[in-house]
Every structure is written in structure tokens, then in C-alpha cells.
């Protein structure tokens, strides 16, 4: 059997600030069973960006319907980009459990702001 | 075993169009984005157009956009290529492939269908 | 843009890399053409995946902005046009192909 990829397709992704960035990511396996999270950054003190469990993100929508059967796309789209929201995004694959255990990360996709044309 | 067969290539003139097909058989096609790729004579290979399982979101390379259009019937395990405003620089193999999980990647191509633009 | 050598040789037997390196993708794919015209066939997507057709002489792996296909055990059959391909769509997907010629 494969082993379990999570891909994160583009290395890096530019965007003009007021704009909206979609972040890309696939897994090759429905198995096993458990939730895609969104980071920002790396390590102890990353933040959660998207959680389609639960939680409130007003800015993020899931790119692909969630509730579709075998969906493997977890891609994200984050509107109205600040500056703020520069940094490297990390889609990460949990196995279900209590709590859930983090089997896999992406590679990471970079996001930068460019200022807004006048 | 996957088989992606490829039809109706032919020999046309600048400004006209064409319509390729290809039909697939042996996974189940509904669940696979679906992709064309295309070969001009003596060069590499070069990405069209790829559209998603459901049909409801295409990809197009600069080069043909606004002129070709990608579409499926998945009742029908088939991929379509309408070719609209044919010029001599369309003139190629144009090869059907499986989209892997992500659309950039291919696991299996078809044997290809030739088009050739001539005046 | 992906960046590939023109050509590579290798002897018969022996074993040969070919490498891909920029562009803007995180994981790349390995495609074979023996002749111009004919159908190409995958041997590598996402990195390290092989087809169940495909002999596992042929292996692919990435480090950082380079992904290497090596072929150990090189036949006189492996002779062909070999295209690396990437993950990110603003790449043109596709590199301009290294010839291997057998030896």
C-alpha cells in the first residue's frame, strides 16, 4: 500500500494585498481516517488557520465541497490578504483519536503580500 | 487495466475547428480530473487544458485559451476537446491523460490522435 | 521553468541520474518517450511513486528545488526522451526533456 502523501503543490504563492490567495492540497489516501488542519508556521507556536471540524474563520473557505464523498482536496482560498497574512501555510493530515495525532505535514507553501497597485 | 483511447484528429485549415474525444475505460473515470496534453512535431511535450472530476472547473494553457474548451460526460467515460479558430501552431499529438490526486500529475496517457492545421 | 540537461549517456548495465531542478514546485513527476510521436509513459508522480507497470530500476527522489530520476541497471531498452514534470501549475508543467542514449 502507498504510503500516505500530503501534497502541497506550489512552493510559493504572491498575492496582492485586498485579494484572495487559495492554498493547495491534496492527500493520496482517505486512510486513515481523520481531519485536515491549516497552519501558519512551523513548530510549537504556529497558529491554526483552518480547521474544518471546527471552529470560526470567517476569512477561509474550503475550495472543493468537504462533504463530497472520497473528497481528497483540502485546499483552502483566504480573501481580503493584509500583509499580516504573509508567512509559510502547512496543510496537515491528523489521525482520528482522542486527542487526534498529527501523522503528516505538507511541504509548505509560502504566501507573500504585494502591496496593492494604485 | 486503464485505457485512454483518442479520436478524431484530422487534417483541417486555419480558422476551422475540431473535436477530439477520448474514451476511457478500466477505473472509474467520474472520480479522476482528466487532462490534455500535446506534442508538436520535433518539439516536447506541452499541457492544454485539465478539467475536474465533476466538470464544473477547467484549466487552460495561455496558448489556447479562449479557443479550446475542455468538457466530460461521465456517464459516458469520455473527454472532449473542442478546438475553435485552429491555427498552424495547433498542429501536434494530442495525447489524453489521467490526472493523479493533484491535476499536474498523470499516471496514464493514451496512445495520442494526430491534428494537423494546413492551409 | 523546469531545467533539464539536454542529454545524458549511460552504459549498459550501469547507472544514471537524470536531474530536474526550479520552477516553483514542491514535488515533482518522471515521464518517458521512446520515439517522437509515441505514447509517453509515467514512471514516476509525486516524487518517489511508480506505477505497477513500471520496473523498479527506475526510482525518483527530491531534495529541495531538485528531483533526480536514476535508473539502475540501465537497459538497452531505456533508450528514450525522458520529461520531468512539476507540481505547480505556473511551471508549464513539463521540462524540455533529456535524451539518454545507451552505450
Known amino acids: 500500500e502507498e504510503e500516505l502523501q500530503v501534497i502541497q503543490p506550489e512552493k510559493s504563492v504572491s498575492v496582492a494585498a485586498g485579494d484572495s490567495a487559495t492554498l493547495n492540497c491534496t492527500v493520496s489516501s482517505l486512510i486513515p481516517v481523520g481531519p485536515i488542519q491549516w497552519f501558519r508556521g512551523a513548530g510549537p507556536g504556529r497558529e491554526l488557520i483552518y480547521n474544518l471540524k471546527e471552529g470560526h474563520f470567517p476569512r477561509v473557505t474550503a475550495v472543493s465541497d468537504p462533504t463530497k464523498r472520497n473528497n481528497m482536496d483540502f485546499s483552502i482560498r483566504i480573501s481580503n490578504i493584509t500583509p499580516a497574512d504573509a508567512g509559510t501555510y502547512y496543510c496537515v493530515k491528523f489521525r482520528k483519536g482522542s486527542p487526534d495525532v498529527e501523522l503528516k505535514s505538507g511541504a509548505g507553501t509560502e504566501l507573500s503580500v504585494r502591496a496593492k497597485p494604485s | 487495466d486503464v485505457q485512454l483511447v483518442e479520436s478524431g484528429g484530422g487534417v483541417v485549415r486555419p480558422g476551422e475547428s475540431l473535436r477530439l474525444s477520448c474514451e476511457a475505460s478500466?477505473?472509474?473515470?467520474?472520480?479522476?480530473?482528466m487532462t490534455w496534453v500535446r506534442q508538436a512535431p520535433g518539439e516536447g511535450l506541452e499541457w492544454v487544458s485539465t478539467?475536474?472530476?465533476?466538470?464544473?472547473?477547467?484549466y487552460y494553457a495561455d496558448s489556447v485559451k479562449g479557443r479550446f474548451t475542455i468538457s466530460r460526460d461521465n456517464s459516458k467515460n469520455s473527454l472532449y476537446l473542442q478546438m475553435n479558430s485552429l491555427r498552424a501552431d495547433d498542429t501536434a499529438i494530442y495525447y489524453c491523460?489521467?490526472?493523479?490526486?493533484?491535476?499536474?500529475?498523470?499516471?496514464?496517457w493514451g496512445l495520442g490522435t494526430l491534428v494537423t492545421v494546413s492551409s | 521553468a523546469l531545467t533539464q540537461p539536454a542529454s545524458v549517456s549511460a552504459n549498459l548495465g550501469g547507472t544514471v541520474e537524470i536531474t530536474c531542478s526550479g520552477g516553483?514546485?514542491?514535488?515533482y513527476g518522471w515521464y518517458q518517450q521512446k520515439s517522437p510521436g509515441s505514447a509517453p509513459v509515467t514512471l514516476i508522480?509525486?516524487?518517489?511513486n511508480r506505477p505497477s507497470n513500471i520496473p523498479s530500476r527506475f526510482s525518483g527522489s527530491t531534495s529541495g528545488s531538485t528531483t533526480t530520476l536514476t535508473i539502475t541497471g540501465v537497459q538497452a531498452e531505456d533508450e528514450a526522451v525522458y520529461y520531468c514534470g512539476g507540481s505547480s501549475t505556473g511551471d508549464g508543467i513539463f521540462g524540455a526533456g533529456t535524451t539518454l542514449t545507451v552505450l
Open positions: 491523460a489521467k490526472s493523479w490526486i493533484w491535476w499536474t500529475f498523470f499516471d496514464y
Open positions: 478539467i475536474s472530476d465533476t466538470g464544473d472547473t477547467a
Open positions: 478500466g477505473f472509474t473515470f467520474r472520480n479522476y480530473y
Open positions: 516553483n514546485s514542491n514535488h
Open positions: 508522480y509525486a516524487d518517489t
